[in-house]
Each structure stands twice: as C-alpha cells, then as structure tokens.
C-alpha cells in the first residue's frame, strides 16, 4: 500500500518551487499534458550551451514525512538527445541528479541550505532510458522515462527534494512522493493494523476480529516488510467464538443464523439445531429445548433434547402367598434416550381400610428403583392386605421435568391367613370298631376356628374311594364303623373365616382286636 506525500499530477495551482541561481535558462514551470490528456504542472530546463560546471537547481516545497522512514520518489520525465541538438555544446548532458534535505520545519530559503551536496544528500544520478530524437524531415519522437528512487532513512519532521541539472534538455513531467506501508490485513480471523515499516522487517501483533477468540499458543504476529508487503508466514490466529462461524474467506465471524448453533470456539460451521430444540436469535452457542424437552447435565451441548418416557405398559402380577412377581412392557415413548430405568412406589391397605406407604418389611428383588429390566419380585406381603404398586419409567431427564410422573398402577390383595395345620392328634379311646381322637386348638390369626375336617383311611387302602371325611365343630371326633384290629391314617384341618388350613401330618392309629380289651387311650 502506498501513501502519497506529494503528487504533482493532482496539483491544479502553480507549484512555485524554488530555483537557483536566478538566471536565464533556469528551470521553468510550464503546463503539460499527461497520458489522459489532463493538464499538469511540469518543470522544464534546456540550457545546453551553458558554461561547464554551472548547475541549475530546482527544489520542491517542504514535505512532511508523516512517520515514514523511507520515502519513494517516482519521477516521470522526458529528455532530448544531445545528438539531435545542433547547437548543443560538449556540456550537453542526458542525466540529472536528485538530492534531498531534511529539516524539522519549512526553514529553507532562496539561498539556504547551501545549494550543494552536503548539506543536500545525494540520492542518485538519473539517466534517461528513452531520449526524444529529431531527425531531419521527421517529427520528433520519444517516450516518457519513469524512475523510482528511495530516500532515507529519514528522521526529521520533513524534507525537500531537489533536482540538479548540469546541461540536460529535459522536462520533469510529474513527481510522486510516497511511502509504503503494510495495508490492514485480516487473515485467519486475525486483524493486523496498517503499519508503516520502520526497519527492514517489523513484527506486528494481531488482534482477533469481532466475535473471535485467540487460539491456544503464542499471540498471533506477522512481519511488515520495508516494501509494504506482509511477510508470508503461517499465522496461529484466532477462531470464532461459540455461536459464530468463519465467513468471507476467514476474515470475519458471522453469527449463526436462527435455527443453527455452534457450541465451541474453533473451526467448524454452525449446525442445524438438534432434535426438539430451537434458537430464536442469531449467534446461538446452544439451542434451547422445546417446552417439555430437556438435556441432562451430562449431555453434550449439541445433543438433542429429550423428554421423560411415558408410563410402562401392561403390568402383570403373579401372587404366590406372600411373594409377588410383577412384570411389564417398556413404555411406548422412550423420550429419545437410551438410559431407561424403572422404579416402583408402593402403598398398602390393611383389612380395616387404613392405608399408608409400604413398610420396611417388604423386600424388592433386584430393588425398588434403578431397575433396568422390566420385572421385580416383592416378598414379605402380609395376608389380607391390598397393595397398590405404581410402576414408573425414568430416564436421564426425568428429574428435570415438572409435573406428575406417569405411572402404570397394579392392585394386589393377598389372601386372608387360614388356620395352621393341626398336629398333636391323640387317641383318647379305641375299640374294635371306633377311635376317639382329640387335638389342640390351633392359633388361627384371622378369627376363631369354626370347625374341623377329619380325613382318614385304612392303611394300605390308598385309592380315593377308601378316603373318608368327618366334620366336627369340637377339637375332638369319634371315628365309627372301623375294622377290627386295623391300622388307620388320620389327618385333621381347621377352618376359619379365611378358609381351611392345611391338613396336618398323618397320624397312625389302630382299632382293638376284641371288645374285652375295652377302651384304651392311645397317644399320638
């Protein structure tokens, strides 16, 4: 990038530069035409017959250097070929010399600084590449010369440029004074400011563009070269912040559009919002879950939003005494998650009707919650109780949802408790044809014993037709019509309101062989 300090092509008024000495044949300001046929201010000198060693000087106005250390001067000039000038003497030249003089203010006068090398600093002696020639009978032909010179290093506030002619016939068509600077550059989302090089190469620190953050590692820098070019080198730059993606050739960060998001800083583009989420604003780092949908704390920011599952289905119960086996089907809606578990809540109602949460005497296998399989075995049920089990399905976002958790209920009522088995049967009297039996009254938990059932058959006669039954309301019974001297197997069960209890162990009794023996008490 070039920053112009002076461009005579753009000047509309007279330049009024200073010449020395004030004599005929001196540099003269004239109007000229440039390539676009625009009128420009030029300086011409053509004193080809001067005395040897006599010089004509032309000095520009004072030019502030504006921080430039090296300034470039592009000269456009024409020069006549000495050979084409019949009256040119040996002093005719096809070169001129360029000088500069530094000062902190516009202090030069018509006579100072002295018109000589030192105090003026010589830049170069400029030779024409193209000479304007005239041959007899033909028009003059020529081309414009373009020469760029480098001044510096400069340290004072400004400078003058001076041209010394020692016998050329030439015109200075334009003078362009400029310095080079590295243009503002944005690369890898890093902005490097416009920089005027003070040395051969200057390190320049970069800053992240809007909505970008520094990448890990050393802060980004580039080198600005003296020629106004950035030195090519890889830039560890910046990356777009969450909610922004690189755009326009990695020169700016663009906010993610509505409906898209970018969760992390770094490379990568905005992605559409995952399932069941949305972003209503631009620049979203995360998409908000729809009402009723959630992300678990452990879910990545880019994960879809999920919802608690629906209730389990079709709970089936199988009661076996004080044990209950429950199993169910998975919910219709898993909520979009894999981490499905089940839990049970339990209430029990006593026969009298009062209800409460189940007591600690129940055991659940494998447990009451965090079940991964759709079944459980409940043990320790009490008889004649009604149990309500609520089976719920849970997942990783169930804890985030408000409102009731859907469940599938099942009611189970246990049987009332029947009397225990009757044992301790005693033979109180026996005869050849009868046996009198007695037993202890069993402790019936659910009410008194209403009656008993005695079951007996002759030993060895096992068929159903040989079994006989006798009901008695007392805890004794007399078996009649028995065979003489025969062995009998006897069992008794008690009945309460809950029903019959189990038959007790078989009791072995024997009738008398003859009457003379009389009644004989036998103990079981």
């Amino acid at each position: 990038l070039e920053e112009t300090l002076l461009n005579t092509k753009l000047e509309t008024a007279d330049l009024k530069w200073v010449t020395f000495p004030q004599v005929d044949g001196q540099w003269e300001e004239l109007s000229g035409l440039d390539e676009e046929q625009h009128s420009v201010r030029t300086y011409e000198v053509c004193d080809v017959q001067r005395a040897p060693g006599q010089a004509h000087w032309l000095r520009t106005g004072w030019v502030p250097r504006r921080g430039a250390v090296h300034v470039y001067a592009t000269l456009r000039f024409t020069m006549l070929e000495c050979l084409s000038l019949p009256r040119a003497g040996r002093s005719c030249k096809e070169t001129f010399t360029v000088f500069y003089y530094e000062s902190d203010a516009d202090t030069a006068t018509a006579l100072t600084p002295a018109w000589m090398e030192n105090p003026y600093i010589k830049v170069d002696t400029v030779a024409a590449e193209h000479l304007t020639r005239k041959r007899p009978g033909a028009e003059a032909t020529g081309k414009v010369n373009v020469k760029t010179l480098r001044l510096g290093p400069l340290s004072k506030a400004g400078f003058y440029l001076a041209f010394q002619d020692q016998g050329a016939c030439m015109a200075l068509l334009s003078l362009h004074l400029f310095y080079k600077k590295c243009a503002q550059l944005t690369v890898n989302l890093t902005r490097f400011p416009e920089t005027v090089p003070r040395e051969l190469v200057v390190p320049v620190a970069g800053s992240c563009v809007v909505d970008a953050v520094p990448a890990p590692g050393p802060s980004p820098s580039l080198y600005c070269r003296e020629d106004g070019q950035w030195a090519e080198q890889p830039v560890t730059g910046c990356s777009c912040a969450p909610g922004f993606e690189a755009a326009e050739g990695n020169t700016k960060c663009r906010a993610c559009a509505q409906g898209t998001f970018k969760p992390l800083s770094g490379e990568g583009s905005c992605q559409p919002c995952p399932a069941n989420s949305h972003s209503n604003t631009i620049g979203s780092a995360v998409c908000q879950c729809r009402v009723g949908y959630f992300r678990a704390r452990t879910d990545p920011r880019g994960a879809p939003c999920t919802t608690p599952p629906s209730a389990p289905r079709s709970v089936v119960s199988r009661l076996n005494g004080s044990s209950l086996h429950l199993e169910w089907s998975a919910p219709l809606e898993s909520g979009g998650r894999e981490d499905l578990t089940y839990a049970l809540r339990c209430r029990e109602c006593r026969p009298g009707g009062s209800c409460a949460p189940c007591g600690g005497d129940l055991t659940f296998d494998p447990g009451p919650r965090d079940l991964v399989e759709p079944w459980v075995v409940v043990r320790g049920l009490r008889p004649d109780f009604t149990y309500t089990f609520e089976v719920t399905a849970l997942n990783g976002v169930s804890s985030l949802a408000t409102g009731p958790v859907p469940f599938e209920p099942v009611n189970v009522t246990t049987d009332r408790e029947v009397p225990p088995a009757v044992s301790d049967i005693r033979v109180t009297r026996s005869s050849p044809s009868s046996l009198s039996l007695a037993w202890a009254v069993p402790r019936a938990p659910s009410g008194a014993v209403l009656d008993y059932e005695v079951k007996y058959h002759e030993k060895g006669a096992e068929g159903p037709s040989s079994v006989r039954f006798l009901k008695t309301s007392e805890n004794r019974a007399e078996l009649r019509g028995l065979k003489r001297g025969a062995s009998y197997l006897v069992q008794v069960r008690a009945r309460s309101e809950a029903g019959y209890g189990p038959f007790g162990q078989e009791h072995h009794s024997q009738t008398q062989l003859d009457e003379s023996e009389g009644w004989r008490e036998q103990l079981a």
Partner: antibody, heavy 126, light 107 residues
Framework: QVQLVQSGAEVKKPGSSVKVSCKAS????????ISWVRQAPGQGLEWMGR????????NYAQKFQGRVTITADESTSTAYMELSSLRSEDTAVYYC???????????????????WGQGTLVTVSS | DIQMTQSPSSLSASVGDRVTITCRAS??????LNWYQQKPGKAPKLLIY???ILQSGVPSRFSGSGSGTDFTLTISSLQPEDFAVYYC?????????FGQGTKVEIK
C-alpha cells in the same frame, strides 16, 4: 502569458523575397513549435511550415518546399519566415503561432497552436 | 499531403440552435485533429485539440468528437459571439493541413 509580436506589413515586388519576424516574450522559447500560417484575402488558413528552435531544422508544406525558409534565433527568442520568388498570389496575412505545449511536456502532440501573432500583411504587387 | 474536407462550407443558424460541423480526412489521422475559430480581422483561436479536448478558457458548449477520418465540432447552443469561421487542422503528418473552413452566419 506569452506574446508573439510580428514585424510590420510589407509590400514586395514579384520575384523578390520577404522575411517576417516573430518575437516571443516570456519564458521558454527553444522547445515550443513555431508554425507559420498564411491567409489570402477572403480565403482560408494555409499551413506553411514549422520549426522547433532547439532542433534548428524545420518541416515545410510540400506546396512551399524550396521557396520558404523558417529559422529561429534562440538567443533573441525570435522566429523568421522567409518566402522567396514572390508572386501576386502570395499576397496574404502571414501569422506565426506557437504550440500549446513544448516538445518535452506533452504525451500527445505539440502542434496545436494556442498563441498567435497579430499577423503581418505581405502585399506582392508590381 | 493529407486533404481535409469540411462541410458545410457555410450555414445559417439562430441563437440557441445546435450546430454541427464535420471534417473528413483523406486518410487515418487517429485523433490528431484541432479546431479553430476565426473572426474577421483577427488571428485564429484554438478551441479543441486532440479531437475532443477543450482548450482552457473555451466555453463548454463547444465539443469535439471523432477518430480516424471523421470528426465533428458541435456547438450545443449557439451564442451571438459564436458567429465566425471554423477550421479543422490535422497534425498527424510532418506536414499540417487545414480544412477550407465553415462560415457560421446569423439566419
């Protein structure tokens, strides 16, 4: 602003010569083109020739070749046009005209004439 | 020499009229063509050079166009001071030539 001042009117006999001068005042002279143009009474403009003083040599219109000589004196900033073998049809106003730009200060062409002398009437009559 | 032919040789027009004068070269002269205005008893005045470049100080109602062999001078709105003779002038060759002139008169 440059001025071109021409010499006074001349009355000449047929077969004689006339030399008209054109003095430029103010600044550079050597690198401008000086043209000579004549205009017979009631007629149009007729270009005769041109000189760029620094080069010394002139270009002439074919019609006047051999009869006209254009010269310049850089030391006095004066151009001259001499026409010989005068005939009555050479009766005209003779103008000198300077180009708009010097040979060194235009990319385009230095032959457009923006400065004219006041004209010199040359009458050829026996 | 290159021949320059102007047309018309004269024209009558009123103040405010748009006037067009043409000039044809006998061979290609690129854009090396100038236009002059001359009033009676006066030296010519340069109006346009390089076919279309307006000389400094010349009113903008004057314009020129063309390249090669066909050229035009246009006065967009004729003013009283514009009644004069107009000449084209080619400078492409080592030998210049003028057109024969166009006289613009008051109608």
């Amino acid at each position: 602003q440059v001025q071109l001042v021409q010499s006074g009117a001349e009355v000449k006999k047929p077969g004689s010569s006339v030399k008209v001068s054109c003095k430029a005042s103010g600044g550079t002279f050597s690198t401008y083109a000086i043209s000579w143009v004549r205009q017979a009474p009631g007629q149009g403009l007729e270009w005769m020739g041109r000189i760029i003083p620094i080069f010394g040599t002139a270009n002439y219109a074919q019609k006047f070749q051999g009869r006209v000589t254009i010269t310049a004196d850089e030391s006095t900033s004066t151009a001259y046009m001499e026409l010989s073998s005068l005939r009555s049809e050479d009766t005209a106003v003779y103008y000198c005209a300077r180009s708009s730009y010097t040979i060194l200060t235009t990319y385009y062409n230095y032959n457009a004439m923006d400065n004219w002398g006041q004209g010199t009437l040359v009458t050829v009559s026996s | 020499d290159i021949q320059m032919t102007q047309s018309p040789s004269s024209l009558s027009a009123s103040v405010g009229d748009r006037v067009t004068i043409t000039c044809r070269a006998s061979q290609n002269i690129n854009n090396f063509l100038n236009w002059y205005q001359q009033k009676p008893g006066k030296a010519p005045k340069l109006l346009i050079y390089g076919s279309s470049i307006l000389q400094s100080g010349v009113p903008s109602r004057f314009s020129g166009s063309g390249s090669g062999t066909d050229f035009t001078l246009t006065i967009s709105s004729l003013q009283p001071e514009d009644f004069a003779v107009y000449y084209c002038h080619q400078v492409s060759d080592t030998s210049d030539t003028f057109g024969q002139g166009t006289k613009v008169e008051i109608k």
